[in-house]
C-alpha cells in the first residue's frame, strides 16, 4: 500500500472501559493530530476505515461490523460497543485516507473488570473539594453522546460500596452530587451509575470518581518559612560541618507552583564556588497543605563561609517571602592556663 | 504609633569615635530587627547592617565591618551604631530604620528616623 | 553585592504627566524591590515593596512593575509635591543595595 502518515500508537489515550457497558471512542485523528474536523473531511471525500491488534497479538485486523445486535458499530468518527466484551482489549486504529491522502493513529483500549464494590485496576479521575466551602458539586463524567436528551436516565450515587442515601451533607441531585459543606471524611471513591434504555435492552454506564478534600483559597496565606528563623543562630567553627534547614508551609492552592531556594550573598548555590549541597524533601497534609524542606550542606565550612549571607526564598501563587539564617563563627573559649590565670595576675 | 528617634547632628574630630542613637517608640522593641542606613551629602544611599535587638545579632556590609559596631539597650528601648577613626568620609547623614513587626531582616523600611548628620572635621 | 543601576539622574516632567523610572539588578532578585521617594531634608519614604505592592497609604497613581532584574516605577500623573528623588532597593538579599537616585524635576 502506498505511504500513510502513521502517528504511531499513542499510549497519551490509554482508554479504559467496563466489561458488559458501552462504550464510545473517538477517533483521535481529529481530537489531537489533525488540524480538521470529521465532517471537513468526510465532505473532502476522505474515508474512516477502523482495524485491530488483539491483546498479545501482532496481526491487524478489520473490526468486525456484523456482530448480532450490532455489538460493535461505527457513526462518524466514533466506534461504538454495545456492550464491550473483554476480549474487546487490544490496540485500535482508525485511518482517513482517499487514493491521495493517509493518516492514521493506533490507541490502545483496555476492558476493565469490576467487583461489586466498583473497585477495579481503572485508573480514576481526582476531583478536589475545598474545605468547608459551601455547597460544591461533582458531575458525573463521560456520559454525553450515550442516549438522546429525550431520554430520562435513572442515575445512582455510591460511596464505596454504599448507595448514598440520607448522607448528612451529601445529596445526590441527578447527574449531580451536591456537598453541602465539604469534609476530611468525605475523602474516597464516588460511583454514579446511569442506567437508560436503547432499542429494547438496557445499558449501564458506571463511573467512578476519587473525591480529595483540599484546604481552601479562603484560608490559604502567603508561604510561611519556620525556619530559619531568628530564634536560632549557627554558631560554627571553621572545619565544621553547617546545615540550616529552610521549612516552609504552603496552603493548598490549586494549580500553584510552590518554589523554594537558597541564595548565598545574593546567588543560587549552582553559580557560586563554595562546595554546598541541596537535599530536599516534601510532605502534605490531609489538605494537601505542603511542607517543604531544602537543607543546605557545607562539609566544612570555613571562616570566610561563615561571613556570608544565607537567605532562604520561597514563593507561591500568594506571595513571596525570604528569611535570613543567623550565622555566625564560633569564638573560641579561652584556655585556662594561659588567658584566664594572667587575667587573675598568676605569674 | 511607631517612632524612631534620633539625634539631630553630631560633630566630631577626625580620629575620633561616636556612638549615634535611635530611640524607638510605638511598638515591641525586641520583635524588630534595626537596620541602619547611611547617607553622604548629595548622594545615594548605603545599608550599613541590622541588629536584632531580642538576641543583639548582627549582619552587617562587609565594606563598614571594622567601622560601624552595632548594639541595642533593651532597657531604654533604644539602639545605637558606634563609627570608630573617623574621617571626612564618614561626614554623612545615618538613618536607623525598620519593618513591621515578626519580620526577619530581608525586607524593605517602611519606617525611618529623621537622621542624624556627622559632620567630621578638624 | 548586587548592584542597582538606575540610568537616568535627572527627569524633567509636567504637573500631569505620566513618568517611568527604570532600575536594572546585576543579578536575578525575582520580586524583591522596593521603591522610595525623599524629598529635600526629608528621610525616605517608602512607596512600593516586593516590586509591585503599594505600602500603605500611597496614591494609587505610584505603581511598579518587573521581576528578574528589570523593575519600573510609574507616577500616573505628576503632582507638584512629587518633586523628589527616586530611588529602588533590592530587598532580596543582603548587603540590600540602593539606586543611585533619579531626581524628578518639575517644569
Known amino acids: 500500500s502506498e505511504r500513510c502518515d502513521d502517528w504511531g500508537l499513542d499510549t497519551m489515550r490509554q482508554i479504559q472501559v467496563f466489561e458488559d457497558e458501552p462504550a464510545r471512542i473517538k477517533c483521535p485523528l481529529f481530537e489531537h493530530f489533525l488540524k480538521f474536523n470529521y465532517s471537513t473531511a468526510h465532505s473532502a471525500g476522505l474515508t474512516l476505515i477502523w482495524y485491530w491488534t488483539r491483546q498479545d497479538r501482532d496481526l491487524e485486523e478489520p473490526i468486525n461490523f456484523r456482530l448480532p445486535e450490532n455489538r460493535i458499530s461505527k457513526e462518524k468518527d466514533v466506534l461504538w460497543f454495545r456492550p464491550t466484551l473483554l476480549n474487546d482489549t487490544g490496540n485500535y486504529t482508525c485511518m482517513l485516507r482517499n487514493t491521495t491522502y493517509c493518516s492514521k493513529v493506533a490507541f490502545p483500549l483496555e476492558v476493565v473488570q469490576k467487583d461489586s464494590c466498583f473497585n477495579s485496576p481503572m485508573k480514576l479521575p481526582v476531583h478536589k473539594l475545598y474545605i468547608e466551602y459551601g455547597i460544591q458539586r461533582i458531575t458525573c463524567p463521560n456520559v454525553d453522546g450515550y442516549f438522546p436528551s429525550s431520554v430520562k436516565p435513572t442515575i445512582t450515587w455510591y460511596m464505596g460500596c454504599y448507595k448514598i442515601q440520607n448522607f448528612n451533607n451529601v445529596i445526590p441531585e441527578g447527574m449531580n452530587l451536591s456537598f453541602l459543606i465539604a469534609l476530611i471524611s468525605n475523602n474516597g471513591n464516588y460511583t454514579c451509575v446511569v442506567t437508560y434504555p436503547e432499542n429494547g435492552r438496557t445499558f449501564h454506564l458506571t463511573r467512578t470518581l476519587t473525591v480529595k478534600v483540599v484546604g481552601s483559597p479562603k484560608n490559604a496565606v502567603p508561604p510561611v518559612i519556620h525556619s530559619p528563623n531568628d530564634h536560632v543562630v549557627y554558631e560554627k567553627e571553621p572545619g565544621e560541618e553547617l546545615l540550616i534547614p529552610c521549612t516552609v508551609y504552603f496552603s493548598f492552592l490549586m494549580d500553584s507552583r510552590n518554589e523554594v531556594w537558597w541564595t548565598i550573598d545574593g546567588k543560587k548555590p549552582d553559580d557560586i564556588t563554595i562546595d554546598v549541597t541541596i537535599n530536599e524533601s516534601i510532605s502534605h497534609s490531609r489538605t494537601e497543605d505542603e511542607t517543604r524542606t531544602q537543607i543546605l550542606s557545607i562539609k566544612k565550612v570555613t571562616s570566610e563561609d561563615l561571613k556570608r549571607s544565607y537567605v532562604c526564598h520561597a514563593r507561591s501563587a500568594k506571595g513571596e517571602v525570604a528569611k535570613a539564617a543567623k550565622v555566625k563563627q564560633k569564638v573560641p573559649a579561652p584556655r585556662y592556663t594561659v588567658e584566664l590565670a594572667c587575667g587573675f595576675g598568676a605569674t | 504609633q511607631v517612632q524612631l528617634q534620633q539625634p539631630g547632628a553630631e560633630l566630631m574630630m577626625p580620629g575620633a569615635s561616636v556612638k549615634v542613637s535611635c530611640e524607638a517608640s510605638?511598638?515591641?522593641?525586641?520583635?524588630?530587627?534595626m537596620h541602619w542606613v547611611k547617607q553622604r551629602p548629595g548622594q545615594g544611599l548605603e545599608w550599613i547592617g541590622a541588629i536584632d535587638p531580642s538576641d543583639s545579632y548582627t549582619t552587617y556590609n562587609q565594606k563598614f565591618t571594622g567601622k560601624a559596631t552595632l548594639s541595642v539597650d533593651e532597657s531604654s528601648n533604644t539602639a545605637y551604631m558606634q563609627l570608630s577613626s573617623l574621617t571626612s568620609e564618614d561626614s554623612a547623614v545615618y538613618y536607623c530604620a525598620r519593618y513591621y513587626s515578626g519580620s526577619n531582616y530581608i525586607s524593605p523600611f517602611p519606617y525611618w528616623g529623621q537622621g542624624t548628620l556627622v559632620t567630621v572635621s578638624a | 553585592d548586587i548592584v542597582m543601576t538606575q540610568s537616568h539622574k535627572f527627569m524633567s516632567t509636567s504637573v500631569g504627566d505620566r513618568v517611568t523610572i527604570t532600575c536594572k539588578a546585576s543579578l536575578d532578585v525575582s520580586t524583591a524591590v522596593a521603591w522610595y521617594q525623599q524629598k529635600p531634608g526629608q528621610s525616605p519614604k517608602l512607596l512600593i515593596y516586593s516590586a509591585s505592592y503599594r505600602y500603605t497609604g500611597v496614591p494609587d497613581r505610584f505603581t511598579g512593575s518587573g521581576s528578574g532584574t528589570d523593575f519600573t516605577f510609574t507616577i500616573s500623573s505628576v503632582q507638584a509635591e512629587d518633586l523628589a528623588v527616586y530611588y529602588c532597593?533590592?530587598?532580596?538579599?543582603?548587603?540590600?543595595?540602593f539606586g543611585s537616585g533619579t531626581n524628578l524635576e518639575i517644569k
Open positions: 510605638g511598638y515591641t522593641f525586641t520583635d524588630s530587627w
Open positions: 532597593q533590592q530587598h532580596y538579599s543582603p548587603p540590600f543595595t
